[in-house]
């Protein structure tokens, strides 16, 4: 055993605002003193296996798992997590020890599990095992349900690893499209974990607890439906289970279904078939394709074929991390006072997002609707024609997204005036932003047509509450206009509004609205 290298396993906790944490699994700067994880040789294991002390991490914490190897010569390595191999770049420190690091940013439930590090040195090969779990803070969680096949039975079990224990229900629907909305009479709910009736058109499983309700739909290709223009797409994260159901109905039993991934038949343990006769004596067959824990190489086109139906495919994409894809550039809109208008954001995301619309520090519920092309859309129509800044915010386990909108309402200016001993000011929030004129009313100009250009100062300011622009114009008082009536007028393409002010000595000022 003297050939075995000296190995040290450490855990580095990063402060969450730590800019040094890299996005790769290379070697970020150490932000806190490393914690020794022991790394003892595991007895009775085939091969040389070192086991680090179990690591418990807070949700959203960022950590680095690090191995220091005191062995001569070069080393090569490979990380494996949930059957997926991850990049590994060893380097050497000042003491010439090999250093291998794995960075976990913003810890989530999906990143918990066993991390295996395989190291090959010139002398020997060995494995290091890290077990990472989320610290049991008494936080409630609600996890999206997933499916498992019931042992030795043609049935699906629905599982949601949530705290407190959720109520699990199957939501079944046998008609098409809109009539499968949640409260439709076509929808049947079964409050149980196991489902044997797997022939329905639309099958979802939902889990609910104090935090709300999360659902997962059984992804289905129906060969009796006309092939769609856009290929259905299914996203999954490494380690999640894959389930696709292929369904076909034919006048008799003389047809079979097959699954292929990139033109290769699925392996024996990755599919199972069920068939039944429907009420009108037609034969329904379903063929499930499943992978209990997906890896990157499960990505590809899954094609379901039948001798009696056109083949159809779905693109399955396995990602390391969830995402939200949408354009985050801010958008400005101007509408008329009674024009119907909705903000909308089109996005592609996995896992499904939680979202809110915010206006003037008030949040509004956010609904999302799936489109045929794999995108989803969220619309907000409840703006009540209030101008200002509207914010769409979305997040899932791994990503966040914010988009800003500005709504301007086209309207004639409304003028408010105020005055002090030295100046008079007028304000307007019409849109487009108004231009200003000041006029003096005198014996020579009883209709107030004598324009004042001296001492006028115009500006636009952002009224913070709603994020809407207010235009103002200030007239500095001079001896020439003291004691006179002056008129400030705001005008834009929709009209003009004026206010008349008597510039007398300090004291209350009468204002005469003049539209």
């Amino acid at each position: 055993n003297q050939d075995l290298p000296v190995i040290k396993c450490v855990l580095i906790n990063h402060k969450n605002n730590d800019s040094s944490v890299g996005k790769s699994s290379s070697y970020p700067m150490v932000s806190e003193s490393p914690e020794d994880l022991g790394c003892a040789l595991r007895p009775q294991s085939s091969g040389t296996v070192y086991e680090a002390a179990a690591v418990e991490v807070d949700v959203s914490a960022s950590i680095t798992l690090q191995v220091l190897v005191d062995a001569p010569g070069n080393i090569s390595c490979l990380w494996v997590f949930k059957h997926s191999s991850l990049n590994c770049q060893p380097h050497f420190d000042l003491q010439n020890r090999g250093v291998v690091s794995m960075v976990i940013l913003k810890m989530t439930e999906t990143q918990a599990g066993e991390y295996l590090l395989f190291i090959q040195s010139e002398a020997t090969n060995y494995t290091i095992l890290f077990t990472v779990s989320i610290r049991n803070t008494l936080l409630y969680t609600l996890r999206r349900p997933y499916f498992r096949k019931m042992e030795n039975q043609d049935a699906l079990v629905c599982i949601s690893e949530s705290v407190p224990e959720p109520i699990v229900e199957w939501v079944l629907c046998d008609s098409q499209g809109e009539s499968c909305k949640e409260e439709s009479p076509a929808v049947v709910k079964k409050e149980e974990k196991v489902l044997h009736e797997l022939f329905g058109t639309d099958i979802r499983c939902c889990a609910r607890n104090e935090l709300g309700r999360e659902c997962t739909r059984l992804f289905t290709i129906d060969l009796n439906q006309t092939p769609q223009t856009t290929l259905p797409q299914l996203f999954l994260k490494v380690g999640e289970p894959l389930w696709i159901r292929c369904k076909a109905v034919h006048v008799n039993h003389g047809f079979g279904l097959t699954w292929e991934l990139e033109n290769k038949a699925l392996e024996e343990g990755n599919y199972f078939e069920m068939s039944t006769y429907s009420t009108n004596r037609t034969m329904i067959r379903i063929l499930f394709a499943f992978v209990s824990s997906v890896a990157r190489n499960d990505t590809g086109y899954y094609t379901c074929s039948s001798s009696k139906h056109p083949s159809q495919s779905a693109l399955v994409t396995i990602v390391e991390k969830g995402f939200i894809n949408a354009t985050n550039s801010s958008e400005d809109y101007e509408i008329d006072q009674y024009e119907e208008f909705c903000f909308s954001v089109r996005f592609k995301a996995y896992p499904q997002i939680r979202c809110t619309w915010t206006f003037s520090r008030k949040s509004f519920p956010c609904e999302q609707k799936g489109l045929d092309n794999g995108y989803s859309i969220s619309k907000f129509c409840n703006h009540k024609h209030q101008p200002g800044e509207y914010i769409f915010h979305a997040e899932n386990d791994d990503a966040q997204f914010t988009k800003m909108f500005t709504l301007n309402i086209r309207r004639k200016p409304q003028v408010l005036a105020e005055a002090s001993a030295s100046q008079a000011s007028c304000f307007s929030d019409g849109y487009p932003l108004p231009s200003w004129t000041w006029k003096k009313c005198s014996d020579k100009s009883p209709n107030c047509t004598e324009e004042i250009t001296e001492g006028v100062w115009n500006r636009k300011a952002n009224r913070k509450v709603f994020g809407q622009w207010v235009s103002s114009s200030t007239l500095n008082m001079s001896e020439a206009i003291k004691g006179f009536l002056v008129k400030c007028c705001a005008y834009n393409s929709l009209g003009t509004s004026c206010e008349t002010i008597l510039l007398n000595s300090p004291g209350p000022f009468p204002f005469i609205q003049d539209n």
Epitope: E260, E262, T303, S305, P310, S311, S313, L315
Partner: nanobody
Framework: QVQLQESGGGLVQAGGSLRLSCEAS????????IDWYRQAPGKQREWVAQ???????FYADSVKGRFAVSRDNAKNTVYLQMNSLKPEDTAVYYC?????WGQGTQVTVSS
């Protein structure tokens, strides 16, 4: 990446015939089946026909009995034979493999 190129479109009188071709290049070994679609002006793209690797063919109800799809594996080409053409068959015709589409070929049927 599979590339697809349609050809054979043109102007034809009602009742006439046309044969469209769809030539595939790139990793054609990965082609399990090829679909034909069409898009008439101002309408959604609709599925027309499919031919599988085993030369099984399937058709939309609107073209059944008039259109026939075939393939020549040696030339990596699929054909859509269109007979008894009607003005409502006027459209741009596309072939598709999985997520890959051709540029389309225009078919105009005059009455």
């Amino acid at each position: 990446q599979v590339q697809l190129q349609e050809s054979g479109g043109g102007l034809v009188q009602a009742g006439g015939s046309l044969r469209l071709s769809c030539e595939a290049s790139g990793p054609t070994f990965s082609i399990n089946y090829i679909d034909w679609y069409r898009q008439a002006p101002g309408k959604q793209r609709e599925w027309v026909a499919q031919i599988t690797r085993d030369s099984n063919s399937f058709y939309a109800d609107s073209v059944k009995g008039r259109f026939a799809v075939s393939r020549d594996n040696a030339k990596n080409t699929v054909y859509l034979q269109m007979n008894s053409l009607k003005p409502e068959d006027t459209a741009v015709y596309y072939c598709r493999v999985l997520s890959y589409w051709g540029q389309g070929t225009q078919v105009t049927v005059s009455s």
